[in-house]
Amino acid sequence: ITQQDLAPQQRAAPQQKRSSPSEGLCPPGHHISEDGRDCISCKYGQDYSTHWNDLLFCLRCTRCDSGEVELSPCTTTRNTVCQCEEGTFREEDSPEMCRKCRTGCPRGMVKVGDCTPWSDIECVHKESGTKHSGEVPAVEETVTSSPGTPASPCS
């Protein structure tokens, strides 16, 4: 997900509706004017605000990256919602790009969870049922290790 460059909006654009602030704040879908006297509407499909605010300009809509699909478009009160394409995922804690899901589990493990836009497949040990964490070879790959190679972490 990427943000467009931020730039103050042209305050007097004719298509922007104006209203008065309430207690110094403007409602969702608006931003406050520089003199604080007006609430100026965001531009549909270009920028937005989701809460009462005193922003001098609306926030620019997110554009979905390649590798993402747009679940819902940007409106004046809600940012674009992007999701990883099928077969890829993005964990909440991971970098901002979609990663390919593994195609299978390592030997001695079974799949208990499918690939979703938010998580890789989930594998557990056949015997103990403990989860496997970390990158591992897919089931089709040959697992080779030299002496002293540490085992993959399991939790």
Epitope: Q3, L55, L56, L59, E96
Partner: nanobody
């Protein structure tokens, strides 16, 4: 390691005021948006307010609009929440939080925040 330490909570009468502070020990504080959330007993954690990295512009939840004011001092790595006209329904543990990633300029949902303080209790009662 990100550390956030809230302070300033306490017992206050309805209509009273409190000022919460949150000290952050992270070098990126001054380049990140930051927010306040609260959690009342038996309820889910909810958004209160968030402020841009530069302090120019903020979001407020409907329930606190016009009563609470968020501010920050980047030179002190500190976030503030001035709470006026407090009501019984404002009683909660208040948390400050930093977002987990930089893909939203002003995040306002719990899932967008990854670093949390331990909270400070605000009780509004007569």
């Amino acid at each position: 390691e990100v550390q956030l330490l809230e302070s300033g909570g306490g017992l206050v009468q309805p209509g009273g005021s409190l000022r919460l502070s949150c000290a952050a020990s992270v070098s990126t504080f001054g380049t990140s948006p930051v927010g306040w959330f609260r959690q009342a007993p038996g309820k889910e954690r909810e958004f209160v307010s968030a402020i841009r990295w530069d302090g120019v512009g903020a979001y407020y939840a409907d329930s606190v609009k016009g009563r609470f004011t968020i501010s920050r001092d980047n030179s002190k790595n500190t976030l503030y929440l001035q709470m006026n006209s407090l009501r019984a329904e404002d009683t909660a543990v208040y948390y400050c939080a930093l977002p987990r990633r930089g893909d939203s300029e002003l995040p306002s949902t719990v899932k967008e925040y990854g670093y949390w303080g331990q909270g400070t209790l605000v009780t509004v009662s007569s």
